[in-house]
Amino acid sequence: HSDGIFTDSYSRYRKQMAVKKYLAAVLGKRYKQRVKNK
């Protein structure tokens, strides 16, 4: 249990979603930059 009350399951899921969101934003930014440079 993450804090004695809750499992760490949901916070793990949310952390994974946050990482995916961040990577999507970074990759999206890079793609836009590449298109702009062309």
Partner: antibody
């Protein structure tokens, strides 16, 4: 440890169509932390559970079910150990029991909202 | 939008019998993040199972979950009168592509 819900119910859960209402949920016996997400679920009379949205106690980031369509807004005050759900432009179809939950593991007792003229 | 289809919508079982409830997801849930809940009339849902097969704290071992991807099952072995309730599955999805969560329609368990 429990979640205490307020707003609506005995405190005036009868709202006229087009009206607004704020439901709040206070964590009791534990402190909200960055590992907690406060989610809201509603249940129309005699029907199933319907996810509304979730807000991070830490960052305040929120996500909503597509059907919500900006009608509802989530907020949180980590210092007050509280999260709230603002309901706007209510219609009779929004009549339901509204539950708050932390990480879908600990649930509030629910607040009945009735929308009727 | 994702859909979680629960079958059957209602099931009757004798005390000591076995109940199986199915939950089919479209699309796949994210990395087996599928939970089960029990709800009795006038009460909030109770957290039973998470990540498809892990038992929540304090839940009797007669409850078990299995499955992955799109197909999940909740089994109650040695059904007791206190198990009469409605059961719901909840899927967690890749939020970037769709809603983060969806509930199944529920299965009413009647104990004879």
């Amino acid at each position: 440890q429990q979640l205490e819900q307020s707003g609506g119910g005995a405190e005036g859960g009868l709202v006229k169509p087009g009206g607004s209402l704020e439901l709040c949920c206070k964590a009791s016996g534990f402190s909200l932390t960055t590992s907690h997400w406060m989610c809201w679920v509603r249940q129309a009379p005699g029907k199933g559970l319907n996810w509304i949205g979730c807000i991070s106690a830490g960052s305040g980031d929120a996500d909503y079910a597509t059907w919500v369509d900006a009608q509802f807004t989530l907020s949180r005050d980590i210092d007050q150990n509280t999260g709230c759900l603002q309901l706007n432009s209510l219609t009779p179809a929004d009549t339901a029991m509204y539950y708050c939950t932390i990480n879908f593991e600990l649930w509030g007792q629910g607040t009945l909202v009735t929308v009727s003229s | 939008a994702q859909v979680l289809t629960q079958t059957p919508s209602s099931v009757s079982a004798a005390v000591g019998g076995t109940v199986t409830i199915n939950c089919q997801s479209s699309p796949s849930v994210y990395s087996s993040y599928l939970s089960w809940f029990q709800q009795k009339p006038g009460q909030p849902p109770k957290f039973l199972i998470y990540e498809a097969s892990k038992l929540a704290s304090g839940v009797p071992s007669r409850f078990s979950g299995s499955g992955s991807g799109t197909q999940f099952t909740l089994t109650i072995s040695g059904v007791q009168c206190s198990d009469a309730a409605t059961y719901y599955c909840l899927g967690a999805y890749d939020c970037g592509r769709t809603d983060c969560h969806a509930f199944g329609g529920g299965t009413e368990v009647v104990v004879k």
